[in-house]
């Protein structure tokens, strides 16, 4: 049965994949240039064995097909994950009436576990993805998205919320991770770096990408976000890496061209509806999946993360606009708004495709280091 839709926004309203060559080894940070990534000062170190650096049934939806020549994460060379030197800068809002523990920020006081104890949990996000260690899971079917192609009206709220740019999505965007795993999209937001400094939250073999998009979904088993927080599978996030490509991305331009209007922290504007799926990679069949957490306080766990293997291409100018337009608190730019990677603590990242199979000539037999946990069976 269909749950009632939330009809009102909160009271504060007023294909895009690339065809670049796969990354070469020179694109990855080197050992000498990149000391081991440390957690920003605002987060306490979490102990763990791998402290690596840097949901009514949906109709049949034809999955997107893979584009020839687009960048694939498994094409990245296998190297030691050195992490990277940048730390997210202090970009927290300071309430005019004084600070309190709810005003978390990147890289500074208060420590996130003091804001929300869940931030010290064992199964946090983001993480470093190592394709060679991912478990190939054939049960992970292509993602299904329905209703993501929005008409221009009604308009959507785009807000600089002080720690990201967030687009609130209307009711009706349905997503399925698989049979019986159905969700409704709530909002999307971005994470980025600064000039010459990448700012994705997840990393791949220690490689940090220029930026990352998150589309946050609520399980259809729940009517409200707070009911789902901390429940396994209550929330699901689709994540994709943004990379530099030769051409302007027309889908992203519909949002990026409006950032100047919300440069001031806390400001918002209305933008015409757009094709939300065009902000994601075209290949819905190849992805990594694991259970983690929100990457900002309250850091609630039980979040199903799906990280696309294919990346999204934006022009250099677009990436610059993203990282250099918005302002955070106290005359500081809103930049480097990513959390440090968190230890897996025994979690196995699953892959919908054989990402961990070494098919190079050196291997006589394909190697698969982890077996599928048969999620969704």
């Amino acid at each position: 049965q269909r749950l009632p839709r939330m009809q009102e926004d909160s009271p504060l309203g007023g294909g895009s994949s690339g065809e670049d060559d796969p990354l070469g080894e020179e694109d990855l940070p080197s050992e000498e240039d990149s000391p081991r990534e440390e957690d920003p000062p605002g987060e306490e170190d979490l102990p763990g064995e791998e402290d690596l650096p840097g949901e009514e049934d949906l109709p049949e939806v034809k999955p997107k097909s893979e584009e020839e020549g687009s960048l694939k994460l498994e094409d990245l060379p296998t190297v030691e994950a050195p992490g990277d030197p940048q730390e997210p800068q202090n970009n927290a809002h300071r309430d005019k009436e004084g600070d309190d523990q709810s005003h978390w920020r990147y890289g500074g006081d208060p420590p996130w576990p003091r804001v929300s104890p869940a931030c010290a949990g064992r199964f946090q996000s983001p993480v470093d993805i190592r394709p060679q260690l991912a478990a190939f899971c054939p049960a992970l079917r292509p993602l299904e998205l329905l209703g993501f192609q929005l008409p221009p009206l009604p308009e959507l709220r785009l807000r600089n919320n002080g720690h990201s740019v967030q687009l609130t999505l209307p009711p009706g965007l349905e997503m399925a991770l698989g049979p019986g795993r159905e969700y409704r999209a709530l909002q999307l937001h971005l994470h980025w770096g600064a000039a010459g400094r990448p700012g994705s939250e997840h990393t791949v073999e220690g490689h940090r990408f220029p930026a990352e998009i998150h589309v946050v979904h609520l399980s259809t088993a729940f009517a409200r976000v707070d009911e789902a927080l901390g429940r396994p599978g209550g929330l699901a996030v689709l994540a994709a890496f943004l990379e530099e490509g030769p051409e302007e991305n027309s889908a992203y331009e519909q949002l990026l061209s409006r950032l100047e209007e919300i440069a001031e922290e806390g400001s918002e504007t209305q933008v015409p509806g757009l094709d939300i799926s065009a902000l994601l990679p075209s290949d819905f069949s190849r992805y990594f999946q694991y259970e983690g957490s929100l990457t900002t306080p309250p850091c609630a766990q039980g979040v199903i993360w799906t990280v696309f293997n294919q990346t999204v291409m934006l022009s250099a100018k677009q990436l610059h606009t993203l990282s250099d337009t918005l302002w955070g608190p106290g005359d500081s730019r809103l930049q480097l708004n990513f959390r440090a990677t968190q230890p897996l603590n025994g979690r196995v990242i699953e892959a919908s495709f054989p990402a961990g199979v070494d098919s190079s000539p050196r291997a006589a037999e394909p190697v698969q280091l982890n077996s599928c946990l048969a999620a969704g069976d």
Partner: nanobody, 118 residues
Framework: QVQLQESGGGLVQPGGSLRLSCAAS????????MGWYRQAPGKQRELVAG???????NYADVVKGRFTISRDNAKNTVYLEMNSLKPEDTAVYSC????????????WGQGTQVTVSS
Amino acid sequence: QVQLQESGGGLVQPGGSLRLSCAASGGDFRFYDMGWYRQAPGKQRELVAGITTRGYTNYADVVKGRFTISRDNAKNTVYLEMNSLKPEDTAVYSCSASHFLGGRIDYWGQGTQVTVSS
């Protein structure tokens, strides 16, 4: 489940002031964007003011400069300070709560009556 309880409404003369309070219980107040809405008889509900988790505020044009929204996370309460009240401000005032993660209104209070009359 979050419960919202408004208080502070009443009868006031034009030009007078009132301070409305909305006390929240049952959830982590810090992670909710809060709003004040009003509905006059025979009219649609309209946004009066909103405040985000981080203290950012916005106001309906008709109340700018007269109304001030604020929040006290220690007391799990959001306030609406209303000055220079006019007869057209007469309405039932209700507060709303929206979890920051979703951006849609999750909870409503029952409302408190504000009457501006001489």
